[in-house]
Interface confidence: low
């Protein structure tokens, strides 16, 4: 699992995302805050996409989910994988891309605040071997059996953005993981490719709100592709 | 107040164990991260092991990577560091550092215990 | 690992009088996402060590405002605008930008 590879702390020796880009395995890891990333190869086309080895859906970007490539597959051997779309089939909300969710096996929209009356059918549905099943809450000790009435607000610890309170998501934050807003127009974003740059964020911001996408600045104009902006903008 | 608080170091000879306790209190200990960080005798600051919030996630220095864990018991408060195969140059103060943060900014070690000393010695 | 040098290591003031410790770092600790993640920290004689400044020029809170850090990438500057007697101790610069953490070696303030 991931974390008996971090608690062996092989870190300068593991595929990525742990160990910064394929091929780089002395890359440096980018504790505070950050992805454990090497730079240069921070922004790859996806001519150069290599499967990105996982464990869980937070090491792969937010427009990604971490599962076996194929159906049935090894458990053992997962990557992250493209979000499904609206009226996608999925069995878990990380299946979905942002805005959306997974509701009786199919990504449908967020719009319509899903979480207020019908977190407690979700949480309940099965999702297979999945960190988001009822099982998974409940050998968390820390949260109360109370936690779906009361939403959490800004800068709550949380362990999903389902604990969060509306337009705010579960986040890490150095070596905590707190409620934190919704990306607005404009804002600062992260733009995960597809090589090397994944990895555990210990500070993470929160995904573009409705009806936005994570894009290069376009008036941006810096040097090195590496270190372009990448802001919240209408689609 | 916010406390943190060292404890089970002692002497012990080369390649033998220790296990050192941070008690906390005065925070939610559930919500920070940990880190232990040592001083050797007449030198400097060096940072040893790190766990997160949950005790999933945990970096360690080379220099005791494969040697020692750290874990942490939420329920109790309380912060470990196991110390296997002590060689000579782990001797020094070991000190319980709270990874403190806001919303929008990281305090890095913004408390810390007063040390409890480990001597490895035949 | 980011290594982290310190000058002076040992620095002799008169009280009332300013005082100023650098630090560089062998990479920049500017990351991407616009912060620098760069840390004082001063140990008084037989104590634990206790947070200056956060993020290179932020004062945690109690400390007096005779403290203050500024410098970007990897140049960074510790000052004092008078020192007192109680400011006497070690003081350490501090990278958290990336695994492992680092410190560096150490400015040995006393009063003259």
């Known amino acids: 699992t991931l974390n008996s590879v971090l608690n062996s702390n092989a870190i300068k020796n593991l595929p990525p995302p742990l160990g910064g880009a394929a091929g780089h395995p002395g890359s440096a890891v980018s504790a505070a805050p950050g992805i454990l990333y090497p730079g240069g190869n921070k922004y790859q086309t996806i001519d150069n996409y290599q499967p990105y080895p996982c464990a869980e859906d937070e090491e792969c970007g937010t427009d990604e989910y971490c599962a076996s490539p194929t159906r049935g597959g090894d458990a053992g051997v997962q990557i992250c994988l493209a979000c499904r779309k609206r009226r996608k089939r999925c069995m878990r909300h990380a299946m979905c891309c942002p805005g959306n969710y997974c509701k009786n096996g199919i990504c449908v929209s967020s719009d319509q605040n899903h979480f207020r009356g019908e977190i407690e059918e979700t949480i309940t549905e099965s999702f297979g071997n999945d960190h988001s099943t009822l099982d998974g809450y409940s050998r968390r000790t820390t949260l109360s059996s109370k936690m779906y009435h009361t939403k959490g607000q800004e800068g709550s610890v949380c362990l999903r953005s389902s604990d969060c309170a509306s337009g705010l998501c579960c986040a890490r934050h150095f070596w905590s993981k707190i409620c934190k807003p919704v990306l607005k127009e404009g804002q600062v974003c992260t733009k995960h490719r597809r090589k090397g740059s994944h990895g555990l964020e210990i500070f993470q911001r929160c995904y573009c709100g409705e009806g936005l996408s994570c894009r290069i600045q376009k008036d941006h104009h810096q040097a090195s592709n590496s270190s372009r902006l990448h802001t919240c903008q209408r689609h | 107040q916010v406390q943190l608080v060292e404890s089970g170091g002692g002497v012990v000879q080369p390649g033998r164990s220790l296990r050192l306790s941070c008690a906390a209190s005065?925070?939610?200990?559930?919500?920070?991260?940990m880190h232990w960080v040592r001083q050797a005798p007449g030198k400097g600051l060096e940072w040893v092991a790190v766990?997160?919030?949950?005790?999933?996630?945990?970096y360690y220095a080379d220099s005791v990577k494969g040697r020692f864990t750290i874990s942490r018991d939420n329920s109790k408060n309380t912060l470990y560091l196991q110390m296997n195969s002590l060689r000579a140059e782990d001797t020094a103060v070991y000190y319980c550092?709270?990874?403190?943060?806001?919303?929008?900014?990281?305090?890095?070690?913004?408390?810390w215990g007063q040390g409890t000393t480990v001597t490895v010695s035949s | 690992d980011i290594v982290m040098t310190q000058t002076p290591l040992s620095l002799s003031v008169t009280p009332g009088q300013p005082a100023s410790i650098s630090c560089k770092s062998s990479?920049?600790?500017?990351?991407?996402?616009?912060?620098?993640?760069l840390y004082w920290y001063l140990q008084k004689p037989g104590q634990p060590p206790q947070l200056l400044i956060y993020?290179?020029?932020n004062r945690f809170s109690g400390v007096p405002d005779r403290f203050s850090g500024s410098g970007s990438g990897t140049d960074f500057t510790l000052k004092i605008s008078r020192v007192e007697a109680e400011d006497v101790g070690v003081y350490y610069c501090?990278?958290?930008?990336?695994?492992?953490?680092?410190f560096g070696p150490g400015t040995k303030v006393d009063i003259k």
């Open positions: 501090m990278q958290s930008k990336q695994l492992p953490f680092t």
């Open positions: 993020e290179v020029s």
């Open positions: 550092a709270r990874a403190g943060y806001s919303l929008y900014y990281y305090y890095g070690m913004d408390v």
């Open positions: 766990i997160s919030y949950d005790g999933s996630d945990k």
């Open positions: 990479q920049s600790l500017l990351h991407s996402d616009g912060k620098t993640y």
């Open positions: 005065g925070f939610t200990f559930s919500s920070y991260g």
